[in-house]
Interface confidence: medium
């Protein structure tokens, strides 16, 4: 004799009893009415299962909750199924067996026929696991059922602090969707909140799970696929205050079927969004967007933000949204990088884009901007990176495209190519009134518009000029004069420089900022406009430093231990971290602080010039870093503002030194012998380079490095030209992760050292 191998299969679900009604007492597990009714309903469920062929496998069951409408019973039951039959008893098959029994004319005296009028249509059976039951049981001491009426915003009572886990069981009208809003009220906690597309905490129906007081998403809204949701809270550490506020609404299903015809222009024409964006998209999302282009000269570009698409094997589900575009199946995934999907138009002038959630697990709503591109020249003057669909500068010495193809097959890299014989000359020699090319082609077209390219400056009227770095040089190079606008910047207040010294003089670096918390210098920064200071994003990554309210910004400061008449201080009204900032890699390490009132410029307080995206800082150029950082690795911060000259290092060499961890948003400076470098406390401070015009331009922000001043390891700075578009967007009110959104890891509170 050999014992038959069985496996415990757990099913969860609900059924409606048409001849009973929900009462408030049934919503409270501790009430006598609940205990009595749940025992009877559990017996009814047991009898129902037992009267089918599943009866021989029956192990146990429980009715753990009741809901509104005709009385809805929420239950689970366990069957011990022979191993060989496991796959044949799917939730669908089990439901069918139970529905057949409910519809049968058998003359049983079981309560599901005599006492309870069970609605076969309303029977829901879902697959569950033993672990789901364990989680459910752990919440039963703090189990809250709420029915959400339409038009009502229902605040949910906070978790019971005596328990370690609570469950909110939410139900609304059948034709509506449940939408939960979660707002973290504290900056640090270790609580976990999980939301399920079911009445109970079924792992296979998990929509999202968040841990800790999430600074990435201080407020989040989450949609269920229908009228039921479960929210489970697990305590992280003891606290007298609720770490979050929960509220819930029942909302109508929003359609996302769109037909659009685009106009024959190349700028952004609109956006497509998942329903209730920026809410998490629902597990039942199915969007179909049909876009028509005006002619086959154009292709369609979809511009994503922190989300990208990639091909996936057909047998693999997309976990963050499935996209069908021109019969291509693509999976979405979250990324801290920009991405564009380019759709070439070949035979038809229309394309249908389908977005579907394939699993219950969802994510933040997806928004995609759309525009047209010229199919014959998708990236005028630049290189189309096929990996991410972006137009990137070509042959500038920086591998912008992950596969490096933008720097392949270059006749001249980070240099000007003479038209006569393809000789390469350095960029500062272009349009300098001295011919260097054989026939002087480097000095031609210097007074007129030229096709835009990697090193051409784009004027406000979108025309381009050949002269490198024409901004604020005292000569009007653009027809519209835009290269000489916004030039109240980059001039030193006083020129008494200590030659070869390390201590700065008053007014020498009038843009230098000291960012402080409770009188302690934490990071450097630079004034870039009358209400804006730029710094490094990693200065704010500690939970205790994330709030703008904590910070004071000092400008015109010389010494940390004393105040003098030339210095002014400001509170911070808003903090913007770059939305792609990633602490582990230090990528996009830039933040903007909006000051509480405008700065009045003086000899000791004035902004540095911001470079254009095309501004070329030449490797080998001597530039300066300033700050109150430590004067030796591990040492204390300096009292007096220090300055040090460093040389800009070619990207390829720096990248090799740091084993290819240097991204295109990074710039290296220093010396191979080390000695001169930034250090702790300098983070976010300016790396500035002086142009021949005498104006100082912001090339970088102190970001990270291996140690301080170590041989073979340069200082790594945020490359301002690669984040300038985001800076301008924030300065002109275009937003970009305001209020302090960031992510959770550890950087040193200032210059990053390993």
């Amino acid at each position: 004799y050999k014992a038959e191998v069985t496996v415990s299969q757990v099913y969860s679900g609900s059924l409606r009893v048409l001849n009973r009604h929900f009462s408030q007492d049934l919503g409270r597990r501790e009430s006598i009415a609940f205990r009595s009714e749940s025992a009877k309903a559990q017996k009814m469920l047991q009898e129902l299962v037992a009267s089918t062929r599943l009866g021989t496998y029956y192990n146990s069951s429980s009715v753990y909750s009741f809901g509104e409408g005709p009385l809805t019973c929420f239950f689970w039951f366990i069957l011990d199924i022979p191993e060989y039959q496991r796959l044949t008893l799917s939730p669908e098959v089990v439901r069918e067996l139970l529905v057949d029994e409910l519809l049968s004319n058998s003359s049983t005296l079981a309560s599901y026929k005599t006492e309870y009028e069970v609605d076969p249509e309303g029977l829901v059976i879902l697959e569950a696991s033993v672990n789901d039951i364990v989680v459910l049981n752990s919440t039963l001491g703090c189990y809250r059922y709420s029915y959400v009426n339409p038009g009502q915003v229902l605040p949910l009572k906070g978790p019971d602090q005596q328990t370690t886990s609570c469950l909110w069981h939410l139900q609304g009208p059948e034709d509506l969707m449940i939408k939960v809003r979660l707002e973290w009220t504290r900056v640090d906690c270790r609580d976990r909140v999980a939301m399920y597309d079911a009445a109970g905490p079924l792992e296979k129906r998990l929509i999202t799970s968040v841990y800790g007081c999430s600074r990435q998403e201080p407020v989040m809204e989450v949609l269920a696929s229908g009228s039921v949701m479960a929210v489970v809270w697990k305590k992280g550490m003891h606290s007298y205050y609720d770490p979050f506020l929960l509220s819930v609404k029942s909302v109508a299903f929003q359609d996302c079927q769109v037909n659009l015809t685009l106009e024959g222009r190349l700028d952004t024409q609109g956006f497509l969004r998942t329903p209730y964006y920026p809410s998490y998209y629902s597990p039942s999302t199915h969007c179909s967007w049909h876009l028509t282009v005006p002619s086959l000269d154009y292709g369609l570009a979809l511009w994503f933000d922190a989300y990208a698409l990639r091909r996936q094997k057909y047998n693999r589900l997309c976990t963050q949204g499935q996209w069908m575009i021109q019969n291509r199946r693509l999976c979405g995934f979250r990324t801290l990088q920009p991405y564009a999907e380019r759709i070439p138009m070949v035979a038809s002038d229309g394309v249908t884009i389908n977005f579907t959630s394939q699993i219950s697990l969802t994510g933040p709503g997806v928004q995609v901007y759309y525009s047209l591109y010229n199919q014959s020249d998708p990236c005028p003057g630049e290189f189309l990176c096929s990996v991410n669909g972006l137009c990137v500068p070509a042959c500038d010495g920086i591998k912008d495209c992950p596969n490096g193809l933008d720097e392949r097959n270059c006749v001249c890299r980070a240099m000007f190519q003479c038209q006569e014989d393809s000789t390469c000359i350095s960029l500062p020699r272009v349009c300098d009134r001295q011919p260097d090319c054989l026939n002087g082609s480097d000095e031609e077209q210097c007074q007129e518009g030229v096709p835009c390219g990697t090193f051409t400056f784009q004027c406000e009227d979108r025309s381009c000029v050949k002269k490198p770095n024409p901004e604020c040089d005292g000569q009007s190079d653009c027809r519209d004069g835009s290269d000489e606008q916004h030039c109240d910047c980059g001039l030193q207040g006083l020129s008494s420089r200590i030659v070869g010294g390390t201590v700065s003089s008053e007014g020498e670096w009038p843009w230098q900022a000291s960012l402080q918390i409770r009188g302690r210098h934490i990071c450097g920064g630079a004034l870039i406009a009358d209400r804006w200071v730029i710094t490094a994003a990693h200065c704010f990554q500690e939970d205790s430093m994330a709030s703008p309210k904590l910070w004071t910004v000092f400008l015109g400061k010389m010494r940390q231990n004393s105040r003098w008449p030339g210095e002014v201080s400001f509170k911070v009204s808003r903090l913007f971290l770059h939305p792609y900032h990633e602490e582990d890699s230090h990528d996009y390490d830039v933040a903007l602080l909006q000051l509480d009132h405008p700065v009045v410029y003086s000899a000791t307080v004035r902004p540095v010039c911001l470079p254009a995206r095309s501004h070329f800082f030449e490797p080998g150029q001597h530039c300066w870093i300033t700050g109150w950082g430590a004067q030796r690795e591990g040492g204390p911060v300096s009292n007096t503002l220090q300055k040090v000259d460093v040389q800009l290092v070619p990207q390829d060499l720096c990248s090799e030194a740091y084993r290819y961890q240097v991204s295109p948003r990074m710039l290296c400076a220093g010396y191979r012998k080390g000695k001169k470098d930034a250090c702790q406390g300098d983070s976010g401070g300016p790396l500035v380079c002086r142009e021949p015009s005498g104006r100082w331009f912001l090339a970088g922000l102190v970001s990270w490095g291996l140690g301080c001043g170590r041989p073979n390891f340069f200082g790594v700075y945020t490359r301002v030209t690669r984040v300038i578009n985001w800076i301008q967007q924030v300065l002109t009110g275009g937003g970009g992760s305001g209020g302090g959104g960031s992510h959770h890891h550890h950087h040193h509170g200032s210059h990053h050292h390993h």
Partner: antibody
Framework: EVQLVESGGGLIQAGRSLRLSCAAS????????IYWVRQIPGKGLEWISS????????AYADSVKGRFTISRDNAKNALYLQMNSLRAEDTALYYC?????????????????WGQGTTVTVSS | QSALTQPPSASGSPGQSVTLSCTGT?????????VSWYLQHPGKAPKLMIY???KRPSGVPDRFSGSKSANTASLTVSGLQAEDEADYYC??????????FGGGTKVTVLG
């Protein structure tokens, strides 16, 4: 006067080992990358190895990798090349050369001071 | 790493110009701006004439100039003089701290 002087060359049987030395003077030795370059008589130059000033970055040409070892002693202003498993094709004039002076790049990958060379003849 | 390609010989009369080529790949000459040129007289050690494509060390006459286009670097010697007769070698950085040399060009000053 800035100077590099190689020594240690000679006639050696294939399969045997030899150690070349390079003595530096007239400059701050520990601030420079140093290279070994060889030249087969009547033929071109071949870079074979380089070592950074702190000995933390070392590189070899594929033709000698696993057989030759470069090292330096900054206290003695000396560079060494340990050559094992010598082959007939290693016969050449061996130069040591200094990285171009300057305090900026990781390397310039350019050699501004050369020794006069030491001859290694490997007999088979 | 394979050697850079240089023509075996080149010649010119005194006062004339001669241009020497050095062809590599997109992984060395084509990728990095670290091309050097050396002059070597018979029985002597090489002498650095050009580094980083076009820069001259102090003491090198401005008759020597370097340039680069795609995978090919060039050295131009203008106003050719008798003492310019020598072997000329190019070199390039090839990534991963490796350097590669060319096979050399023998320059003859005619007359």
């Amino acid at each position: 006067e800035v100077q590099l002087v190689e020594s240690g060359g000679g006639l050696i049987q294939a399969g045997r080992s030899l150690r070349l030395s390079c003595a530096a003077s007239g400059f701050t030795f520990d601030e420079h990358v140093i290279y070994w370059v060889r030249q087969i008589p009547g033929k071109g130059l071949e870079w074979i190895s380089s070592i950074s000033w702190k000995s933390d970055i070392i590189a070899y040409a594929d033709s000698v990798k696993g057989r030759f070892t470069i090292s330096r002693d900054n206290a003695k202003n000396a560079l060494y090349l340990q050559m094992n498993s010598l082959r007939a094709e290693d016969t050449a004039l061996y130069y040591c050369a200094r990285e171009k002076d300057g305090d900026f790049y990781y390397y310039y990958f350019a050699m501004d001071v050369w020794g006069q060379g030491t001859t290694v003849t490997v007999s088979s | 790493q394979s050697a850079l390609t240089q023509p075996p010989s080149a010649s010119g009369s005194p006062g004339q110009s001669v241009t020497l080529s050095c062809t590599g790949t997109s992984s060395d000459v084509g990728y990095y701006n670290y091309v050097s040129w050396y002059l070597q007289h018979p029985g002597k050690a090489p002498k650095l004439m050009i580094y980083e494509v076009s820069k001259r060390p102090s003491g090198v006459p401005d008759r020597f100039s370097g340039s680069k286009s795609a995978n090919t670097a060039s050295l131009t010697v203008s106003g050719l003089q008798a003492e310019d007769e020598a072997d000329y070698y190019c070199s390039s950085y090839a990534g991963s701290n490796k350097v590669v040399f060319g096979g050399g060009t023998k320059v003859t000053v005619l007359g």
